[in-house]
Amino acid sequence: AVDLTLLANLRLTDPQRFFLTCVSGEAGAGRGSDAWGPPLLLEKDDRIVRTPPGPPLRLARNGSHQVTLRGFSKPSDLVGVFSCVGGAGARRTRVIYVHNSPGAHLLPDKVTHTVNKGDTAVLSARVHKEKQTDVIWKSNGSYFYTLDWHEAQDGRFLLQLPNVQPPSSGIYSATYLEASPLGSAFFRLIVRGCGAGRWGPGCTKECPGCLHGGVCHDHDGECVCPPGFTGTRCEQACREGRFGQSCQEQCPGISGCRGLTFCLPDPYGCSCGSGWRGSQCQEACAPGHFGADCRLQCQCQNGGTCDRFSGCVCPSGWHGVHCEKSDRIPQILNMASELEFNLETMPRINCAAAGNPFPVRGSIELRKPDGTVLLSTKAIVEPEKTTAEFEVPRLVLADSGFWECRVSTSGGQDSRRFKVNVKVPPVPLAAPRLLTKQSRQLVVSPLVSFSGDGPISTVRLHYRPQDSTMDWSTIVVDPSENVTLMNLRPKTGYSVRVQLSRPGEGGEGAWGPPTLMTTDCPEPLLQPWLEGWHVEGTDRLRVSWSLPLVPGPLVGDGFLLRLWDGTRGQERRENVSSPQARTALLTGLTPGTHYQLDVQLYHCTLLGPASPPAHVLLPPSGPPAPRHLHAQALSDSEIQLTWKHPEALPGPISKYVVEVQVAGGAGDPLWIDVDRPEETSTIIRGLNASTRYLFRMRASIQGLGDWSNTVEESTLGNGLQAEGPVQESRAAEEGLDQ
């Protein structure tokens, strides 16, 4: 069972001093991270017992395994059901505490009732303040039964529940019909899923015989021990004031566990701590009684004395619950209460015994849960004890349960039951996950969901190239860390599998399913450098670069050009998908912007070193295009251009640029500046006769503007070959700007 205790402080003179504390003895409880499972939850459960709304209760976490609820302002805040939830996964467990008002009309004689399937449960509500009206019993908040107030017996109203079944479990209440529900007597009924002394899915297994008021859990056969007792069968008392499955917790305050109610996982329920009784757990046990709620009687023999916390304290020479066993009677010594082995292992189990006459090898035997008796293969005889060693046949799951070591001599016999847990080695249900890859390494997350039992002690990762028959390489890693597989071959598929192990011999599980993980290409190592660049417009940039000459083939698929606009914090990436390319035109840039430019070689998804950066300033955007451009041939070597100024100019035009190109020609165009921006016509001279030309123009303010429409015109025929076109604006000659 989960080691979870809900403590209620019942010193009720002042509700503001009342508190509930939930304590977990589970490893890592309450940390709330993925590694350790969800945190402890402590809350009031208002589904059945609803109380008037008040200020919210305060939850305080004390370390990783304790949570406390405070902030109760009035007695009615306390009435009802509280629950603590702890443990992770399938072990998540809810512990419930039911609080009754001490001033209620009806009070429960006993709050928690744990009964076996098929038993008759009797809930008894004692009359505290009488009313002459019907008494209504409810189950989980719904009507269940009515009693006439005349039906009280010895001042008590009894509800008999014959042949109870697990669905009958829950919160029961008895209320005078016209009284406040807060004046009800509240009970908790826990119905074990099996008959007395049985546990398991078909109730076929026998309980270990829990001592000192411990209750056998119907699912796992473990004893849920009362507060103050420990051991597989609750055979051992804790020191006064201690509780928890290993007696590891201590009651707060100077008066120990006085005034505290302890609630444990079902099917135990709640009780006072060992040595205390009463509705508020403030009364010490009467002489001769001990244990939780003082329910146990000492009945010590042979001069034993009764301790209200631990039971009989035996004089020298005697032992046993009632000091009924002489020390001459053989006695099993130091037997572990619980052992854990892995499936299909063949463990050795030791059992030591002492006594007079001295036990010999044949007098000690080991009995399995199915009744099979094993005889020891070897015995080690020492002056004070004999230790028998048993070689256990290959374990199967059915061997889980309570084993018994028994010693018999002419002086008598003794036996000690202990629990054997047969655990299934873990087997991964999924393949490991690839996190990142490089050309020679893979980073893998190895821990996946698994079948079988934890905890995971080691993780082995097996890997080899795909379709290879070579031996698997193996790496052993920490369960909580990612693994880096190193020294791999680039661009190679690897089959990768996980193998999980749990503690103990034979804890290695089968390999999990394989997955294919492929290493990346080799990283490109060459660093390009920028040869040059020039602006081809306010938003266009032509870039050229080079690579060092190295022997062998080029490792690369192309180039990545990066332009960084620091002002706007934006990066532009241009992919050049040919490794032979050494130039690129970048378009759609932002005019008037400072760019940092670099280029790097790429291969698959990997980038090589970047070139040293260059800083480029694009000119600001120019004016709109000139309008209504028109061309008119004047002679065999002259064509006149006319236009209208651009509209909506952002400033004065500094010049116009005319582009002249032979139609259908393959040569570069020629550019001619018109330096008188006020003009709206110009003559282009020096053209070839009978030749068709294309013209367009643009204005410049700080930067060049948009091109106008293109116009075509042919020179007149049969002239001489001209030296090349020139321009005249109002008879002024201009040179070429090529």
Epitope: Q132, T133, D134, I136, K138, Y143, F144, Y145, T146, L147, D148, W149, H150, E151, L177, E178
Partner: antibody
Framework: EVQLLESGGGLVQPGGSLRLSCAAS????????MSWVRQAPGKGLEWVSR????????RYADSVKGRFTISRDNSKNTLYLQMNSLRAEDTAVYYC????????????WGQGTLVTVSS | QSELTQPASVSGSPGQSITISCTGT?????????VSWYQQDPGKVPKLIIY???NRPSGVSNRFSGSKSGNTASLTISGLRAEDEADYYC??????????FGTGTKVTVL
């Protein structure tokens, strides 16, 4: 569906006896308080008796106290009314009714059975 | 007291509201919030229409409402309809944990 079916009514002479039965179904009979209510021809409703689930507690109207006995058999899901020393004024339709759990009202009624006391 | 007092008859036109009173003592109506009302059509079984003074069972029209003041409980039928014509009885728990019924009221829809 809750059903209550009365039987046992008929003609009886003054001073005679009659036993009415009410067969219940559709609910957990053994958990609920049950009542008998009667209605004389052309008159109003008159509560007669009630019995608690265990059968250990009973109540009667003053007009029938000492003459009528209410009882129940939870194993048979049946309610009874034993009527002795019958009088002419006991002539009525007798209804068996289920009391709501945890309150005082009658949420389901049977169809009734007629008892006629006449010489 | 053997019976609670109700008016013998109450009438109203369709669409009107009518109220039926039910007067008892501090030992019944005045002492508890356990007043219920039943509707009985001629020759039929009584049907619960109000419980615990003002609660309506599911399926009962919200034209029926209940209230209580002192020793008198009331049933109001608003938006009177022809099908509301019936006998109406109040009932209360008593201090001796018994029931007492009212004398009954015949409701006529004009």
């Amino acid at each position: 569906e809750v059903q209550l079916l009365e039987s046992g009514g008929g003609l009886v002479q003054p001073g005679g006896s009659l036993r009415l039965s009410c067969a219940a179904s559709g609910f957990t009979f053994s958990a609920y308080v049950m009542s008998w209510v009667r209605q004389a021809p052309g008159k109003g409703l008159e509560w007669v008796s009630r019995i608690y689930p265990s059968g250990g507690g009973t109540r009667y109207a003053d007009s029938v106290k000492g003459r009528f006995t209410i009882s129940r058999d939870n194993s048979k899901n049946t309610l009874y009314l034993q009527m002795n020393s019958l009088r002419a004024e006991d002539t009525a339709v007798y209804y068996c009714a289920k009391e709501a759990g945890g309150s005082y009202f009658l949420d389901y009624w049977g169809q009734g059975t007629l008892v006629t006391v006449s010489s | 007291q053997s019976e609670l007092t109700q008016p013998a008859s109450v009438s109203g036109s369709p669409g009107q509201s009518i109220t039926i009173s039910c007067t008892g003592t501090t030992s019944d109506v005045g002492g508890y919030n356990y007043v219920s009302w039943y509707q009985q059509d001629p020759g039929k079984v009584p049907k619960l229409i109000i419980y615990e003074v003002y609660n309506r069972p599911s399926g009962v029209s919200n034209r029926f409402s209940g209230s209580k003041s002192g020793n008198t409980a009331s049933l109001t039928i608003s938006g009177l309809r022809a099908e509301d014509e019936a006998d109406y009885y109040c009932s209360s728990k008593t201090s001796s944990v018994t029931y007492v019924f009212g004398t009954g009221t015949k409701v006529t829809v004009l």
